[in-house]
Amino acid sequence: SGTTNTVAAYNLTWKSTNFKTILEWEPKPVNQVYTVQISTKSGDWKSKCFYTTDTECDLTDEIVKDVKQTYLARVFSYPAGNVESTGSAGEPLYENSPEFTPYLETNLGQPTIQSFEQVGTKVNVTVEDERTLVRRNNTFLSLRDVFGKDLIYTLYYWKSSSSGKKTAKTNTNEFLIDVDKGENYCFSVQAVIPSRTVNRKSTDSPVECMGQEKGEFREI
């Protein structure tokens, strides 16, 4: 149902990385505008992005209130310039989004190697603990704060002079690996949430190599 000059939104899609969460939909509006509502399964509807001509709405502020909740959004279509107009059923045309549980579904952003330090034949590689928009006690939480031990990192490393890679894993943000003295190594990391069945892994971090600025070398 709905007025003759509005069409319902479709292809409602959640785009979420490290809890930054945007709802996208189609079509590009022609003589119509949209309003989005979001709710938890048991909560009240909250309106966002009022009468917008955009086809996306940033819902981060709502979902970060409880990232373990399951959310549902809906997109209402109104005739441009006549937003009080309703459909034949007495309410505006709308379409529901798929359900979205941020903790289980947000994509893991590409990690960054913060630093590496060589001490003799050991290298300590540290992964940057990225800040999220999830807040607790007025402080932004890091990815590790949110996921705890549910988040692990996989390190790929290899001698600059060869192609054979090795791997290690950690449930902190640090790796301590053995290396051959006098060899330069390159590193890349990947974030993983083993308990998930989808969106389990991030893309690989940019490669960082010894002998470049980011690291520190100490001969002991």
Epitope: K166, T167, K169, R200, K201, T203, D204
Partner: antibody, heavy 117, light 107 residues
Framework: QVQLVQSGGGVVQPGRLLRLSCKAS????????MHWVRQAPGKGLEWIGL????????IYDPKFQGRFSISADTSKNTAFLQMDSLRPEDTAVYYC??????????WGQGTPVTVSS | DIQMTQSPSSLSASVGDRVTITCKAS??????LNWYQQKPWKAPKTLIY???SLADGVPSRFSGSGSGTDYTFTISSLQPEDIATYYC?????????FGQGTKLEIT
């Protein structure tokens, strides 16, 4: 449900090559690491290597590096183990396994490879 | 590379007995240790992961303990269906390495 179905084993002459397949169903291999493990007759388990099918990263036990090659075709949801210059001591049952990053949670049924002239 | 030394290589026990198998790593593996059960002509099955966690669907008579380099696998009350070979596996860093296996028999 999750399944790994292996194929490609058999009897092969020394020096030849063989490619084993591990066809996954019930999940997308891009979301997991895929491993190959072998077991010679009457012996223990031996880890060969792994692949991250999403980016093609491969890691091998150094003793298999060069002669064995792991690959994946995400469009076919299948992982492969190619073994070159096969030797009699490569005779074993070869298993593929899915790694959820905690443990190998699903295994293929195993495929026997016999290297003999 | 990390070496895993598993003992004993075989053991015989009676139904109801408490059975213990150990694995010693050549360096700290930070609890990245799993225990697998393998029955003849079958693929291995995970019993314990991250040294102490019970895998889904595994009976509670199986348990694991340990940290650093020393790990223990225990069957609190041996059942006839537990006849199998048991392996530890370290997966903290590559190459992943299995223990040599422990063949468990019932007397």
């Amino acid at each position: 449900q999750v399944q790994l179905v292996q194929s490609g084993g058999g009897v092969v002459q020394p020096g030849r090559l063989l490619r084993l397949s591990c066809k996954a169903s019930g999940f997308n291999i891009k979301d997991y690491y895929m491993h190959w493990v072998r077991q010679a007759p009457g012996k223990g388990l031996e880890w060969i290597g792994l692949i991250d099918p999403e980016n093609g990263n491969t890691i091998y036990d150094p003793k298999f590096q060069g002669r064995f090659s792991i690959s994946a075709d995400t469009s076919k949801n299948t992982a492969f183990l190619q073994m070159d210059s096969l030797r009699p001591e490569d005779t074993a049952v070869y298993y593929c396994a899915r790694d959820n990053s905690y443990y190998f949670d699903y295994w293929g049924q195993g495929t026997p490879v016999t290297v003999s002239s | 590379d990390i070496q895993m030394t598993q003992s004993p290589s075989s053991l015989s026990a009676s139904v109801g007995d408490r059975v213990t198998i150990t694995c010693k790593a050549s360096q700290d593996i930070r609890k990245y240790l799993n225990w697998y059960q393998q029955k003849p002509w079958k693929a291995p099955k995970t019993l314990i992961y991250y040294a102490t966690s019970l895998a889904d669907g595994v009976p509670s008579r199986f348990s694991g303990s340990g940290s650093g380099t020393d790990y223990t696998f225990t069957i609190s009350s041996l059942q006839p269906e537990d006849i199998a070979t048991y392996y530890c596996l370290q997966h903290g860093e590559s190459p992943y390495t299995f223990g040599q296996g422990t063949k468990l028999e019932i007397t």
